[in-house]
Interface confidence: low
């Protein structure tokens, strides 16, 4: 899928628009709100009933080149005891984050926008079981 | 920036870090995953700690529909069903990188933006804060 | 589930499971196996995008493996063992197996024996 053009008949094309080159983008990698922060609850990883973990994924041709992804730790979920009800099930809540993807061909370098699925944290659910015969 | 390994063949001139703008390539990869978590899943329902999906949208970002989750209740879903105050239910945030129109309107020219989500909730154990 | 019976410990079986039904984007199948009296144990599962997961007393004698066209999962083990002894049962769940299955639920297929004597 291409990124889609501004569909609105509303949305003139403005003149002071840079020139690009045909099946491209000019794509300004300095990121708005680069300083924002998280501000989830603390520690609801560990105080989570489907708590998670996390690994960092380094890749040194993406930017960023850092993204986190988080795994749950049991199957099923904690109990009010504190042991695990394999009644109910973690599972993972996934979300799609943009990319910038840097490829090396010889001695040109070309860029690529990339949707990545990160899994964010784990929520506990029934299961639904689709049994076989 | 990020250092990346260079080919030792090519001629220095090359930046090792990203540049500040770049040019894209207008086709995006993986760009076939399904962006409406309803139909991927209906965890949203299923939790124990449920949340609500709503739309927010704004032609001039991409992608341009991004669905935002909002707990249903302060508690969470016991067996019986019934919601338990002893526990709480917590969005998951996360931030995730979207393409803003850059000068605004333009079609094919766009900066990074950080934006704050929040992805779904997950039941937790209150942090309860005695006062003397 | 097929594909079960008794055989000699060292030898090999091969179990099947024909599945329908599930329509999630992300999914995840597997085996899991109970013995008399004991607790139900998670064997080998395998997610929609075909990574593999495995208990530890299988790894490296059984391999989950599955035929998308005919919509089958199967679990060839070798190197069978007295312990492996158990009725086998496959399931499929929406969602991520890290680990594989050991579902809760008593709602399941018929499973198929297998018992290994030494």
């Known amino acids: 899928r291409k990124i889609p053009k501004v569909g609105h008949t509303f949305f003139q094309k403005p003149e002071s628009c840079p020139p690009v080159p045909g099946g491209s983008m000019k794509l300004d990698i300095g990121i708005i709100n680069e300083n924002q922060r998280v501000s989830m609850s603390r520690n609801i990883e560990s105080r989570s009933t489907s708590p998670w973990n996390y690994t960092v994924t380094w890749d040194p041709n993406r930017y960023p080149s850092e993204v986190v992804q988080a795994q749950c730790r049991n199957l099923g979920c904690i109990n009010a005891q504190g042991k695990e009800d394999i009644s109910m099930n973690s599972v993972p809540i996934q979300q799609e984050t943009l990319v910038v993807r840097r490829k090396h061909q010889g001695c040109s370098v070309s860029f690529q926008l990339e949707k990545v699925l990160v899994t964010v944290g784990c929520t506990c659910v029934t299961p639904v079981i689709h049994h076989v015969q | 920036g990020i250092t990346i390994p260079r080919n030792p063949g090519c001629p220095n001139s090359e930046d090792k870090n990203f540049p500040r703008t770049v040019m894209v390539n207008l086709n995006i990869h993986n760009r076939n995953t399904n962006t409406n978590p309803k139909r991927s899943s209906d965890y949203y329902n299923r939790s124990t700690s449920p949340w609500n999906l709503h739309r927010n949208e704004d032609p001039e970002r991409y992608p341009s529909v991004i669905w935002e989750a909002k707990c249903r209740h302060l508690g969470c879903i016991n067996a019986d069903g019934n919601v338990d105050y002893h526990m709480n239910s917590v969005p998951i945030q996360q931030e995730i990188l979207v393409l803003r129109r850059e000068p605004p309107h333009c079609p094919n020219s766009f900066r990074l933006e950080k934006i704050l989500v929040s992805v779904g909730c997950t039941c937790v154990t209150p942090i309860v804060h005695h006062v003397a | 589930e097929s594909g079960g019976g008794s055989v000699q410990a060292g030898g090999s079986l091969r179990l099947s499971c024909a599945a329908s039904g599930y329509t999630y984007r992300s999914y995840c199948m597997g085996w899991f196996r109970q013995a008399p009296g004991k607790e139900r144990e998670g064997v080998a599962a395998?997610?929609?995008?075909?990574?593999?997961t495995y208990t530890d007393s299988v790894k490296g004698r059984f391999t989950i493996s599955k035929d998308s066209a005919k919509n089958t999962l199967y679990l060839q083990m070798n190197s069978l063992k007295p312990e492996d002894t158990a009725m086998y049962y496959c399931?499929?769940?929406?969602?991520?197996?890290?680990?594989?299955?050991?579902?809760?639920?008593?709602?399941r297929g018929q499973g198929t024996q297998v018992t290994v004597s030494s």
């Open positions: 399931a499929i769940l929406d969602g991520y197996c890290y680990r594989p299955i050991r579902t809760g639920y008593h709602d």
């Open positions: 395998m997610n929609s995008d075909g990574t593999t």
